[in-house]
Amino acid sequence: DAISSGDDEDDTDSSEDFVSENRSNQRAPYWTNTEKMEKRLHAVPAANTVKFRCPAGGNPTPTMRWLKNGKEFKQEHRIGGYKVRNQHWSLIMESVVPSDKGNYTCLVENEYGSINHTYHLDVVERSPHRPILQAGLPANASTVVGGDVEFVCKVYSDAQPHIQWIKHVEKNGSKYGPDGLPYLKVLKHSGINSSNAEVLALFNVTEMDAGEYICKVSNYIGQANQSAWLTVLPKQQAPVREKEITASPDYLE
């Protein structure tokens, strides 16, 4: 689950960011890959590695310096120091701690000018969290009688998640029991005999299959659930693609 901030490529990648010098084409520094600089705010779990990049060009080849909170960033400013890979215009900090939080500015300069770019680093200390479900999933679906449909529930959980697919059902023509609670049927759940519990596939559907389908996910910390609706159309009607996805926001984190 370890994630590193900045782009994920290794410093052994083949994309060389150096621009060769040409005396007749002198030029102030410029950014060569702004896509790698778009993400300014980096929230990273403690103990992870952070890499900030400022790919630049210029003639003569510019130099790169790093500032922390507007001041020169020295090796002794953090335990374990940091690495600068000049050929990749990168700053690498391993095993970040809360004191590493702050603004990191790359200052790229040559005799014709200078440019700078600032990243903000937030070091997040980890706490156990309940499952997080991807917004918009499962998505509403429609199909004709006899058709097939698939609902997908994307789950993120550090701890082992238990996934259940639940549908509201009727008993003796009633949706609710004497206690006022709805009648629910577990259609599928994660376990030994269940393959890919994040997907609920329905085949050869009938009108009876129409209704609300709930993806309920629990771990030892708590629960989350989201639902989607299945519309079953008569055979002669073509399915209408749902434009709006309705997701219960109750458990979104």
Epitope: D1, P128, A159, N219, G222, Q223
Partner: antibody, heavy 114, light 107 residues
């Protein structure tokens, strides 16, 4: 800040019941499981069960199934653990703990003695 | 139920020592293991969860590793305040079982 405050010590007779409360504050009570764990004198930790207050879903250690009942009152952000048919072996400190076992109550000593 | 077998049950070490406690699960629990510290008369404190994630505010001398059935908890440099009993716990499936504990003493 997150706090779990448990009810006071109890002395009970064998065969009777005890109900321990755990009042939560400083976080959204309904968003996390509430676990109950006990520790007999000089012994290790034993998980009793848990409740998800939002919908009342419970999970129990089979060892306590039928004797332990865990409930939650959303209006007061309080969880309860009731243990019936008490015997001397139930003498222990009973703890409530938030979902990730990251916050614990101070413990409630239950003594079962004739 | 998943059994958690912790060893040793007690150990004596000097300040500054590296201390290692192990826990073995009776079945694969992936990385769903937590470690707690408990001092006499106090509630347990969460140190490590999901096998290797150090909980907020826990000193960096405490670390955890392992997956599957074998797990290790390490104190890199023992401090006087680390004298306590340490427990492992699996949070893979209910019931969430604990190891029997390791009592750590200063030599």
């Amino acid at each position: 800040q997150v706090q779990l405050v448990q009810s006071g010590a109890e002395v009970k007779k064998p065969g009777s019941s005890v109900k321990v409360s755990c009042k939560a504050s400083g976080y959204t009570f309904t968003s996390y499981n509430m676990h109950w764990v006990r520790q007999a004198p000089g012994q290790g930790l034993e998980w009793i069960g848990a409740i998800f207050p939002e919908n009342g879903d419970t999970s129990y250690n089979q060892k306590f199934k039928g004797r332990a009942t865990i409930t939650a009152d959303k209006s007061t952000s309080t969880a309860y653990m009731e243990l019936s048919s008490l015997r001397s072996e139930d003498t222990a400190v009973y703890y409530c703990a938030r979902g990730g076992f990251d916050y614990w109550g101070q413990g409630t000593t239950v003594t079962v003695s004739s | 139920d998943i059994q958690m077998t912790q060893s040793p049950s007690s150990l004596s070490a000097s300040v500054g020592d590296r201390v290692t406690i192990t826990c073995k699960a009776s079945q694969d629990v992936s990385t769903n293991v937590a470690w707690y510290q408990q001092k006499p008369g106090k509630a347990p404190k969460l140190l490590i969860f999901s096998a290797s994630y150090r909980y907020t505010g826990v000193p960096s001398r405490f670390s955890g590793s392992g997956s599957g059935t074998d797990f290790t908890f390490t104190i890199s440099s023992l401090q006087p305040e680390d004298i306590a009993t340490y427990y492992c716990q699996q949070h893979y499936s209910s019931p969430y079982t604990f190891g029997q504990g390791t009592k750590l003493e200063i030599k």
